[in-house]
């Protein structure tokens, strides 16, 4: 008996071939001997089966002695043995219909779990193997689970169902709802305008929800809410914003915040949360602000940074085109009695400059100039 695997919702074509390469009378029946369809004269005729409105044949093939049974919009319960009667012969085809669905929505928040459930006909014992977009393989029986979804899990999951040495492939598009970056650091000199961007790693037609940016300044004992906003069909509207600092927010995606001035008291870490409509849980992105200030007070040239810096970052003070006078893995460096000239304060990571501030030191009889 020939075995054919089908996918729920798809169309399957069961073949039946006569030895004579011409149109002759044929009938398709199910295992209960109920007629599904056949031909009478040149007409396609249908029987009283449940498939009536979903069964068809391909008349253009009858001339060649081929009498297919086409079943559209397959259901699991269409799994059965189908019998083609032609030329006093009976051809049997066993159809097994499988369905593979994601537990809930196919749009899941980062960190959530994905469960794929296999619908299969009674008496079948299929095995399932799924391959994620990042090439991770998972195997299982009726259910497959992946916990802690990551951004790289977004995309097409390819699942193969094996039964009777035959296989059928399902493709499920999964969208992991997350920000493009889990964390970002902005390095700014004191007084500069700060731009925070929170690009999403997915696109959906309608995006609705609400969000908030909580900020923990390095100098502050507790965090505070800097801004709250609503998102409606990708349009951003500010609900509430603090007076200090007075953040500005872009009206369109990606989410964009502007801090008019980088000041030491703002240096610190923020957490932007976005709660999406009809989703449990929130999207998070951490943002860090590092602020640099270079000053000269009497005979002391000082460079300081505020905010979350890693211990391996190097802070240096050097006269332009000269070797660094001072270089330390600390958040403040200084030079006593600095020579006149253009001094550079550099924050670097393995030789790569992250932040630079220049200060001009004048001969001792004048006052310093900060460009």
């Amino acid at each position: 008996k020939k075995v054919v695997l089908g996918k729920k919702g798809d169309t399957v074509e069961l073949t039946c071939t006569a030895s004579q390469k011409k149109s002759i009378q044929f009938h398709w029946k199910n295992s209960n001997q109920i007629k599904i369809l056949g031909n009478q004269g040149s007409f396609l005729t249908k029987g009283p089966s449940k498939l009536n409105d979903r069964a068809d044949s391909r008349r253009s093939l009858w001339d060649q002695g081929n009498f297919p049974l086409i079943i559209k919009n397959l259901k699991i319960e269409d799994s059965d043995t189908y019998i083609c009667e032609v030329e006093d012969q009976k051809e049997e085809v066993q159809l097994l219909v499988f369905g593979l669905t994601a537990n809930s929505d196919t749009h899941l928040l980062q960190g959530q779990s994905l469960t794929l459930t296999l619908e299969s006909p009674p008496g079948s014992s299929p095995s399932v193997q799924c391959r994620s977009p990042r090439g991770k393989n998972i195997q299982g029986g009726k259910t497959l689970s992946v916990s802690q979804l990551e951004l790289q899990d977004s995309g097409t999951w390819t699942c193969t169902v094996l039964q009777n040495q035959k296989k059928v492939e399902f493709k499920i598009d999964i969208v992991v709802l997350a920000f493009q970056k889990a964390s970002s650091i902005v390095y700014k000199k004191e007084g500069e305008q700060v731009e925070f961007s929170f690009p999403l790693a997915f696109t959906v037609e309608k995006l609705t929800g609400s969000g908030e940016l909580w900020w923990q300044a390095e100098r502050a004992s507790s965090s505070k809410s800097w801004i709250t906003f609503d998102l409606k069909n990708k349009e951003v509207s500010v609900k509430r914003v603090t007076q200090d600092p007075k953040l500005q927010m872009g009206k369109k995606l990606p989410l964009h915040l502007t801090l008019p001035q980088a000041l030491p008291q703002y240096a610190g870490s923020g957490n932007l949360t976005l709660a999406l409509e009809a989703k449990t849980g929130k999207l998070h992105q951490e943002v860090n602000l590092v602020v640099m200030r270079a000053t000269q007070l009497q005979k002391n040239l000082t460079c300081e940074v505020w905010g979350p810096t890693s211990p391996k970052l190097m802070l240096s003070l050097k006269l332009e085109n000269k070797e660094a006078k001072v270089s330390k893995r600390e958040k403040a460096v200084w030079v006593l009695n600095p020579e006149a000239g253009m001094w550079q304060c550099l924050l670097s990571d393995s030789g790569q400059v992250l932040l630079e501030s220049n200060i001009k030191v004048l001969p001792t009889w004048s006052t310093p100039v900060q460009p």
């Epitope: 004269g41 040149s42 005729t45 008349r59 001339d63």
Partner: antibody
């Protein structure tokens, strides 16, 4: 002898109804699909309707769809054509025909025809 | 709908003549074609089915050929009882459609 005999024709006013019958004999009626074909005076042949052997599948010409109904009673070896909302252009000789059981069709047995005249 | 065009619409011939009637379909119908003969006041009679298959009891002087869109009915030697109107009919698609007919008259 294989035979088909139509009856029920006659004169009817536009908008009226008529039911044609076709009595089959000499063959296993319940094993064959059947059709109705008509011929207007001095004109060619026009296929009207088809019914499968079990009466489940029916096809109609666009010109009669929604007005004519083909049916059969296999226990009485009889084919019917219920004609409603008749129009002048339905005036014709109506033939019942047996569909050849070969896979290519063709109507291999025909009745002698019954005349339907639609006129006021 | 598939249109069936027959030619000629009428012809005059003598007993013993070879007569050819053609039928053209507006689209390919493979071999889904039948030919009928109809005499005045009588029901049509099936002559050929599947373009070239002779119906049981029909004299062998009748033959059919063709496939796709062009078909031919040939009467190899016309007999007195063959004077009638001939129709082609496609059964590839519903609605079934007939050609306009070819009337074969005595010359």
């Amino acid at each position: 002898e294989v035979q088909l005999l139509e009856s029920g024709g006659g004169l009817v006013q536009p908008g009226g109804s008529l039911r044609l019958s076709c009595a089959a004999s000499g063959f296993t009626f319940s094993s064959y699909a059947m059709s109705w074909v008509r011929q207007a005076p001095g004109k060619g042949l026009e296929w009207v309707a088809f019914i499968s052997d079990d009466g489940i599948t029916k096809y109609y010409a666009d010109s009669v769809k929604g007005r004519f109904t083909i049916s059969r009673d296999n226990s009485k070896n009889t084919l019917y054509l219920q004609m409603n909302s008749l129009r002048a252009e339905d005036t014709a000789v109506y033939y019942c025909a047996r569909d050849d059981s070969s896979g290519y069709g063709g109507m291999d047995v025909w009745g002698q025809g019954t005349t339907v005249t639609v006129s006021s | 709908d598939i249109q069936m065009t027959q030619s000629p619409s009428s012809l005059s011939a003598s007993v013993g003549d070879r007569v050819t009637i053609t039928c053209r379909a507006s689209q390919s119908i493979n071999r889904w074609l039948a030919w009928y003969q109809q005499k005045p006041g009588k029901a049509p009679k099936l002559l050929i089915y599947s373009a070239s298959n002779l119906q049981s009891g029909v004299p062998s002087r009748f033959s059919g050929s063709g496939s796709g869109t062009d078909f031919t009915l040939t009467i190899s030697s016309l007999q007195p009882e063959d004077f009638a109107t001939y129709y082609c009919q496609q059964s590839y698609n519903t609605p079934l459609t007939f050609g306009g007919g070819t009337k074969v008259e005595i010359k």
